[in-house]
């Protein structure tokens, strides 16, 4: 849903959320293009691209939250993700530089679609929270009480280290979206029931 417009239909909304999380756990949409663009597509370098522990809530943590807490945690985490993705975008090569070095412009376009897609997911998370009468959550187009700050990597001037940090973050992000998808898959057919 765009611009904060919300569906009142639970099953439709849940279906959208499941579809969005399915797409977002797909590494071919974000991590793989990032690895290619940043020249990390070498076995030795790929080994260094591991998820940083604690960067994202675990599936176990998410499952233990209950619907309300889960949606609030997801909303806050997606806020952090938007910042990290914007930060990564700032340091990507420009389109003309990619063309000069023979890299695929489509990879850059995939990376630049990530933030709007996260925004769309976050809007649906807000809508689902409204549907479940969770009035604590900030409306997507209004400022919140402050985005909870992530365990941000110490800013580094080392370009290679920055690339690896980006890679680790994206690996964690895809894993997190996989966990989110699994939690949503357990939600029941109505707002009031949950399959166990």
């Amino acid at each position: 849903a765009a611009m904060g417009s919300c569906s009142k239909e639970y099953r439709m909304l849940l279906g959208q959320l499941q579809k969005q999380t399915d797409l977002m756990q797909d590494t071919s949409r974000l991590l793989d293009p990032y690895i290619r663009i940043q020249g990390l597509d070498i076995p030795k370098l790929r080994e260094h691209c591991r998820e940083s522990p604690g960067a994202f809530p675990s599936e176990e943590t998410l499952r233990g939250l209950g619907r309300r807490g889960f949606l609030q945690t997801l909303n806050a985490t997606l806020g952090r993700v938007l910042h990290r993705l914007a930060d990564l975008e700032q340091h990507l090569p420009k389109a003309q530089d990619l063309e000069r070095s023979g890299l695929n412009i489509e990879d850059l376009e995939k990376l630049q679609m990530a933030r709007p897609n996260v925004l769309g997911l976050r809007n649906n998370v807000y809508c689902m929270a409204q549907l479940l009468d969770n009035s604590d959550m900030t409306e997507p187009t209004k400022a919140g009480r402050g985005t909870p700050q992530p365990p941000t990597p110490t800013p580094t001037s080392d370009v290679f280290q920055r690339k690896l940090e980006g890679c680790s973050f994206l690996r964690g992000y895809h894993r997190f979206m996989h966990s989110v998808g699994r939690v949503f898959s357990k939600w029941g057919e109505s707002p009031n029931r949950s399959r166990r």
Partner: antibody, heavy 121, light 111 residues
């Protein structure tokens, strides 16, 4: 009343430094990302830098990155712009602006009246 | 960087007549159903003031003679019935990616 008041502008020589401040009042400062936007005399508007609500993330215009540093002190409801290695082309009125809307896709809904920075020998 | 091209550079319109300002982006500033385009008004000696956000949403307190439309690369600000107080320079702004960039401005005057 929601208000932003800039200070710290003035005349500085090329290569010199200046620190701009923006005092915010009338709203929960720590809940908003904040930006600096500049306007050269008789010219259009140019976004310069943005800082996230908690201060962990910063975004810069390419030709100021490495020379300018945006920062904030939420306890003091203040935004700053440290400008080093100033050039003649940095001459402009610098506006402090509040960011609203979708995270990282903001627009600016409240602006200060601006402070003039003149870089000249 | 996304380049925003505004047209015309200046516009003279009679009181009560319609004024139309266009803004074209060098690449799409829309994605996933969102239009990341905003419109500002700036009067001499004053800071800019937001009129329209996300292409078509009227900012609170702005008269409804102002409206915005468009998606992708082409956007329009319309003043349905120009008033004396609308004399100003109008700017478009995209926030699709960093750096955010403004259009060059359109000066609106009374004919």
């Amino acid at each position: 009343e929601v208000q932003l008041v800039e200070s710290g502008g003035g005349l500085v020589q090329p290569g010199g430094s200046l620190r701009l401040s923006c005092a915010a009042s009338g709203f929960t400062f720590s809940s908003y990302a904040m930006s600096w936007v500049r306007q050269a005399p008789g010219k259009g508007l140019e976004w310069v830098a943005t800082i996230s609500d908690g201060g962990s993330f910063t975004y810069y215009l390419d030709n100021v990155r490495g020379r300018f540093t945006i920062s904030r002190d939420n306890a003091k409801n203040s935004l700053y712009l440290q400008m080093n290695s100033l050039r003649a082309e940095d001459t402009a009125v610098y506006y402090c602006a509040r960011d609203v809307g979708h995270t990282t896709f903001w627009y600016f809904d409240v602006w200060g009246r601006g402070t003039l920075v003149t870089v000249s020998s | 960087d996304i380049v925003m091209t505004q047209s015309p550079d200046s516009l003279a319109v009679s009181l009560g007549e319609r004024a139309t300002i266009n803004c074209r982006a060098s690449k799409s500033v829309s994605a996933a159903g969102y239009n990341f385009m905003h419109w500002y008004q700036q009067k001499p000696g004053q800071p800019p003031k937001v009129l329209i956000y996300y292409a078509s949403n009227l900012e609170s307190g702005v008269p409804d003679r102002f409206s915005g439309s468009g998606s992708g690369t082409d956007f329009t600000l319309t003043i349905s019935s120009l008033q004396a107080e609308d004399v100003a320079v109008y700017y478009c702004l995209h926030s699709r990616e960093f750096p955010f960039t403004f259009g060059g401005g359109t000066k609106v005057e009374i004919k």
